[in-house]
Interface confidence: low
Amino acid sequence: GWVWNQFFVPEEMNTTSHHIGQLRSDLDNGNNSFQYKLLGAGAGSTFIIDERTGDIYAIQKLDREERSLYILRAQVIDIATGRAVEPESEFVIKVSDINDNEPKFLDEPYEAIVPEMSPEGTLVIQVTASDADDPSSGNNARLLYSLLQGQPYFSVEPTTGVIRISSKMDRELQDEYWVIIQAKDMIGQPGALSGTTSVLIKLSDVNDNKPIFKESLYRLTVSESAPTGTSIGTIMAYDNDIGENAEMDYSIEEDDSQTFDIITNHETQEGIVILKKKVDFEHQNHYGIRAKVKNHHVPEQLMKYHTEASTTFIKIQVEDVDEP
């Protein structure tokens, strides 16, 4: 019968001829009376056999990532009779892996959006690298992820590539971050190859800023001839948030006389002071009212940022009109 061990050949061998192993018949007594032949894809071009001894050699550099095994056939013939000594047999040559491929991030570019002020541990995105080397061959394709840029705001789980928040971020200070992740094979041991990717992380706004009046005191005037409903002036607050998180509502906090009202212009986000009751210079020639401003939409979990609404004082002077 045929005698052989399993055949392995390392990929990327630079030698012109690399001995892989020996194929022989147990009837071969070593007197050179048998002839060994190799058939199949790669026979003669990639692999050759010593016709006398059955020794097999690789004569070309192999790439496991291109082809990881070769199925060949072997024959042994009695030179004297020309007849087959053993039935033709199929055997396999496996190409063993070396660490010749760096990890690659295939889903680039990465982009993620996460709410500002998210707590530590919040998941941002998972990045995944692929390594063409053999995952079953040692650590050649076992990857470890690390953060090259992005501290102290982000961290990456070494084995999963999951990026998490490690420190609260304020969109009003910086609204996007570039994070650079490295994937290293060989679980980071010597001889490891690496690849990197960039992740653009954008912070979405949350309502963590309350509106604040631009002025702590406003001065307005109203003519005693002004009809009810007259707009006598505007007040304005600013909010560092954006979009609906910056929409605000103005209201009267204090007006003992119940003479004025404030409505909100939702397009300009201004407060419009309105005359609710006619005024009479002879009766009262100045008024003091206090206004407050609050955001229109505040989720309950963000109310902590909105305790104590911003207030302002409005002094209103009544202008005298000569009466006939």
Partner: antibody
Framework: QVQLVESGGGVVQPGGSLRLSCAAS????????MDWVRQAPGKGLEWVAV????????YYADSVRGRFTISRDNSKNTLFLQMNSLRVEDTAVYYC????????????WGRGTLVTVSS | EIVLTQSPGTLSLSPGERATLSCRAS???????LAWYQQKPGQAPRLLIY???SRATGIPDRFSGSGSGTDFTLTISSLEPEDFAVYYC????????FGQGTKVEIK
């Protein structure tokens, strides 16, 4: 380990000043809003002041507004309470407390430091 | 400001008994914004319950919270020797206010 340690308490005369400190360790101090809560001898708990994680906003109880100032140094992981114009009724154990990220109840407290205002 | 009133002021019970502590608010408190703390003599308060009914990390399941609106309850199903302490409720929806405390003492 995760802890808060207050210091700076002592005996002071009415009208005097004291500065309390609270040293934080074992957690990312700069990520948390921090508060001072006090407890008069044999009495209940009273909230005093809060400062946001970055120091940008501060709020005070009516009883101390204008007299007490809360501040923090994130580079030194330390919270402060500057107490001026002290009154006898300010006598209490002062605790620093950490607010949670997802709410604003207090999940970590120090052991407290005693402030006694007495003539 | 929201005023919290705790009752009873003192609760005298034996180990193994059930303790029921009440906290009443002067105006409605969203149940998301009520916490319970335990305090032993000479020690800092310790968070037990938040959001009216969620147990804090490491708190045994004999402690439970319930209630909504203006009435809230802390229940200790079977008192252990280490549970004898003062318990405070706290609302944190409108500034921060605490109840005056309930002392649970050994009978």
């Amino acid at each position: 380990q995760v802890q808060l340690v207050e210091s700076g308490g002592g005996v002071v005369q009415p009208g005097g000043s004291l500065r309390l400190s609270c040293a934080a360790s074992g957690f990312s101090f700069s990520s948390y809003d921090m508060d001072w809560v006090r407890q008069a001898p044999g009495k209940g708990l009273e909230w005093v002041a809060v400062i946001w994680y970055d120091g940008s906003n501060k709020y005070y109880a009516d009883s101390v507004r204008g007299r007490f100032t809360i501040s923090r140094d994130n580079s030194k992981n330390t919270l402060f309470l500057q107490m001026n114009s002290l009154r006898v009724e300010d006598t209490a154990v002062y605790y620093c407390a950490r607010e949670t990220g997802e709410g604003w109840y207090f999940d970590l407290w120090g052991r407290g430091t005693l402030v006694t205002v007495s003539s | 400001e929201i005023v919290l009133t705790q009752s009873p002021g003192t609760l005298s019970l034996s180990p193994g008994e059930r303790a029921t502590l009440s906290c009443r608010a002067s105006q409605s408190v969203s149940s998301s914004y009520l916490a319970w703390y335990q305090q032993k003599p000479g020690q800092a308060p310790r968070l037990l319950i938040y959001g009216a009914s969620s147990r804090a990390t490491g708190i045994p399941d004999r402690f439970s919270g319930s209630g909504s609106g203006t009435d809230f309850t802390l229940t200790i199903s079977s008192l252990e020797p280490e549970d004898f302490a003062v318990y405070y409720c706290q609302q944190y929806g409108s500034s921060w206010t605490f109840g005056q405390g309930t002392k649970v003492e050994i009978k």
